[in-house]
Amino acid sequence: AFGISGVQKYTRALHDSSITGISPITEYLASLSTYNDQSITFALEDESYEIYVEDLKKDEKKDKVLLSYYESQHPSNESGDGVDGKMLMVTLSPTKDFWLHANNKEHSVELHKCEKPLPDQAFFVLHNMHSNCVSFECKTDPGVFIGVKDNHLALIKVDSSENLCTENILFKLSET
C-alpha cells in the first residue's frame, strides 16, 4: 500500500513527457468494454457524438475504436531512468477525425473532431492493472483516469494505489 504518494510517484512528470515521433508505433482496432462486460458505444446525435456504456443485445455488433499507440519518453531528471523511462500513450478514435478527449474542467470524456497534431487532451497513458484489462490515464492530469459513472464515461481521480484496481477504471479490449 503506497497511499496517495504512490499514485503520484507512478504518474509524476506526465505533463512534461514528450511523445517520440509524430507517428504511432502501432494501431489496433478493438471494441472497448468495461470490466463488467458492458460495451462502450458511440451514437451520432444532433451532429455530435455521445458516448454510452450499455449492455448490448445478443448478436448486436460492438462499436470499434482505433487505438493508436505512441511512445513517450520521461525526462531523465524526473524518472531517474535516464532514457529508459518509456511509457505508452494512446489515442482513441471511434470514427474518422473524431477522438476521445479529456475535459478536465467538467470531469468528462468527450468526442471532438480535430486535426493532427492532436492536443494533449486526446492522449492517455496506457496502464495494465490486470493481464486482460487496461486503464487510461489523462496525459494532462496525472492520477485521473477514464472511468464509468452513471452509465457514461467520466474522469475519475484515483487517490491511492489500492484504487488503481477499482473496476470502474478497468476496460477490456477485444478484436471481436
Epitope: F2, G6, K9, Y10, I25, T26, Y28, A30, Y69, E71, H74, S79, G80, D81, D84, G85, K86, M87, L88, V125, L126, H127, N128, M129, H130, S131, N132, V134, S161, L164, C165, E175
Partner: antibody, heavy 122, light 107 residues
Framework: EVQLVESGGGLVQPGGSLRLSCAAS????????MTWVRQAPGKGLEWVAS????????YYPDSVKGRFTISRDDAKNSLYLQMNSLRAEDTAVYYC???????????????WGQGTLVTVSS | DIQMTQSPSSLSASVGDRVTITCLAS??????LAWYQQKPGKSPKLLIY???RLQDGVPSRFSGSGSGTDFTLTISSLQPEDFATYFC?????????FGGGTKVEIK
Amino acid sequence: EVQLVESGGGLVQPGGSLRLSCAASGFTFNNYWMTWVRQAPGKGLEWVASITYTGGGTYYPDSVKGRFTISRDDAKNSLYLQMNSLRAEDTAVYYCTRANYYYNTYGGFPYWGQGTLVTVSS
Amino acid sequence: DIQMTQSPSSLSASVGDRVTITCLASEGFSNDLAWYQQKPGKSPKLLIYAASRLQDGVPSRFSGSGSGTDFTLTISSLQPEDFATYFCQQGSKYPLTFGGGTKVEIK
C-alpha cells in the same frame, strides 16, 4: 544502467523448495511489470510468472500454477520467486526480466538478468 | 493458449546472406510480438518489439514484419556475430508463449 541480478539457485531434491531473488537497479522499479522466464538445458524459453507494477496481480502458466509464487518488494527493489513441490522438469536457468514500458506489458522484455540455475534431482 | 510455431528450426547460411525466420501463431492477435537473439551461455537479447520496431542499439540489418498470425524476422546481410538462436514471443494474451527457436549456423 539497468541491472537485474538473480540469486538463490542451486541443487534441490524433488518435492523440495527454493526461493529465487532478483535485485534490480538503475530504473524506477515500482513502475514496471516484472516477469520470470526459464530455459531448460538445451531447450527453448518458457514464461514462468508475471507480476503487475502495483503488485496487485500475479499470473502463471498451468505448469507452475499452485506451486510457484511471484512477489515483489518495492522498498528493496527486489523480485522473488518462491518455488515449492519442485519436479525434475523444473530444472532450468531462471531469468528475471523487466517490461519495456512503465505500467504495462506491451513490447517484450528488453532487460534480462544473467540467470540462475535450478537443478532438481535426487 | 496461443501456440507460436517457428520455422525453420535451424538453418545454415553464409556471411552476407539474407536470412528470413518466420513465426506462425495458432490464432490472430494484436502485434505484441517480439524477437530475441540468444548466444550460448548468454541471456536473450531483445531485437524487435511491436512486430516491427527495432530495439535501441540493435543494428538496422535486423527487421521485423507481419500481423495477425504471420510474423517474420529478416537479417538483410548476415554478419559473423549474428550466428545464434532466435526466438519469437507473443505478449498479447496470457499465457505468454515463445516460439521453439531457430538456430542460425555457419554454412
